[in-house]
């Protein structure tokens, strides 16, 4: 009786169960009644990540500099080529097909996680007692400056964007 | 059971094509094997690869005679075809056709001879 | 790339062993388990004998085996019989989808 289901690494063809190509092999041909499956190794540029019955490879991910990419993790005959964005950018999405500038955090806003090649910069706004004057990629949130260590008083409070003013205490009394 | 057949004319003139066409019978050229190839093998010499093709039409030739040879398949007729351009008399050989990278079926061989 | 280096020919009496060497480098025989073994009786088309260095396909007598160290290949037909008298040929994978074969052995059987 010929079989309606197959172990785990094959497949049904013709009423018999043949093997599954391994990870980085390519199916040539069928099992058949006299020999096993024919498979082959994938070429050069090429890959297969699973247990497969793929007649033709995956060619690798081409990291084009043209669009900010370059290789993090060169890809092998199992393995895609992973890409990355160049220093200043990010992945435009999961797939990384294109890179985008890194934002910067606008004044009144600090960086709360620097960016990487793979996300975006994250800002937070400045809360009470910090401020960012700056419009940066880099910069976190800096304290308003304590006038009182250096035995002076505030003239000007701070807000998100600007720090305190700091002036000689009045001493006329 | 699967069967290869070699045809074309067994005499062709130097600097001419050479054309063949094998025909498989006993299965489909576009399923249970998807890559198919060319050997030959000159009067009393050893076996040369040629080249294969993919039953959706991807070639993979012998880097030695690359620039001379095409193959080519039509899944419509169940045959792929072998051209080999201007030829000499080293290109006398019996050719066959045959099944995957592994060779397990053949054709029976057709001798071309190559003389004026 | 260069055809593989196979003995021209090898010799033995009936129920003896032969072995037939193939000889290539890192870049086939070394680099790949897929070699094969072909034998040819005179004017017939070659057979498959032995595949993926050691696989024999079913049908074929369990007399041939074959093997593989480092960058050879070898065939061994033991206890020899008449219809053994054949050329006998190994092929392998070369990388990139290309293939190259041996330039052949004549195996006499002796007596």
């Known amino acids: 009786e010929p079989p309606t289901a197959c172990r785990e690494k094959q497949y049904l063809i013709n009423s018999q169960c043949c093997s599954l190509c391994q990870p980085g092999q390519k199916l040539v041909s069928d099992c058949t009644e006299f020999t096993e499956t024919e498979c082959l190794p994938c070429s050069e540029s090429e890959f297969l990540d699973t247990w497969n019955r793929e007649t033709r490879c995956h060619q690798h991910k081409y990291c084009d500099p043209n669009l900010g990419l370059r290789v993090q993790q060169k890809g092998t005959s199992e393995t895609d080529t992973i890409c990355t964005c160049e220093e200043g950018l990010h992945c435009m999405s999961e797939s990384c097909e294109s890179c985008v500038p890194h934002r910067s955090c606008l004044p009144g806003f600090g960086v709360k996680q620097i960016a990487t090649g793979v996300s975006d910069t994250i800002c937070e706004p400045c809360p009470v007692g910090f401020f960012s004057n700056v419009s940066s990629a880099f910069e976190k949130c800096r304290p308003w400056t304590s006038c009182e260590t250096k035995d002076l008083v505030v003239q000007q409070a701070g807000t998100n964007k600007t720090d305190v003013v700091c002036g000689p205490q009045d001493r006329q009394r | 059971q699967l069967q290869l057949q070699e045809s074309g004319p067994g005499l062709v003139k130097p600097s001419e094509i050479l054309s063949l066409t094998c025909t498989v019978s006993?299965?489909?050229?576009?399923?249970?094997?998807?890559?198919w190839g060319w050997i030959r093998q000159p009067p009393g010499k050893g076996l040369e690869w040629i080249g294969n093709i993919y039953y959706r039409g991807d070639t993979y030739y012998s880097p030695s005679l690359k620039s001379r040879v095409t193959i080519s398949v039509d899944t419509s007729k169940n045959q792929f075809s072998l051209k080999l351009n201007s030829v000499t008399a080293a290109d006398t050989a019996v050719y066959y056709c045959?099944?995957?990278?592994?060779?397990?079926?053949w054709g029976q061989g057709t001798l071309v001879t190559v003389s004026s | 790339q260069s055809a593989l280096t196979q003995p021209p020919s090898a010799s033995g009496s009936p129920g003896q062993s032969v072995t037939i060497s193939c000889t290539g480098t890192?870049?086939?025989?070394?680099?790949?388990?897929?070699v094969s073994w072909y034998q040819q009786h005179p004017g017939k088309a070659p057979k498959l004998m032995i595949y993926?260095?050691?696989k024999r396909p079913s049908g074929v007598p369990d007399r041939f085996s074959g093997s593989k160290s480092g960058n050879t290949a070898s065939l061994t037909v033991s206890g020899l019989q008449a219809e053994d008298e054949a050329d006998y040929y190994c092929s392998s994978y070369a990388g990139s989808n290309n293939l190259v074969f041996g330039g052949g052995t004549k195996l006499t059987v002796l007596g």
């Open positions: 006993g299965g489909s050229i576009s399923s249970s094997s998807y890559y």
């Open positions: 993926e260095v050691s």
């Open positions: 045959a099944k995957g990278f592994r060779f397990d079926y």
């Open positions: 890192s870049s086939d025989v070394g680099g790949y388990n897929y």
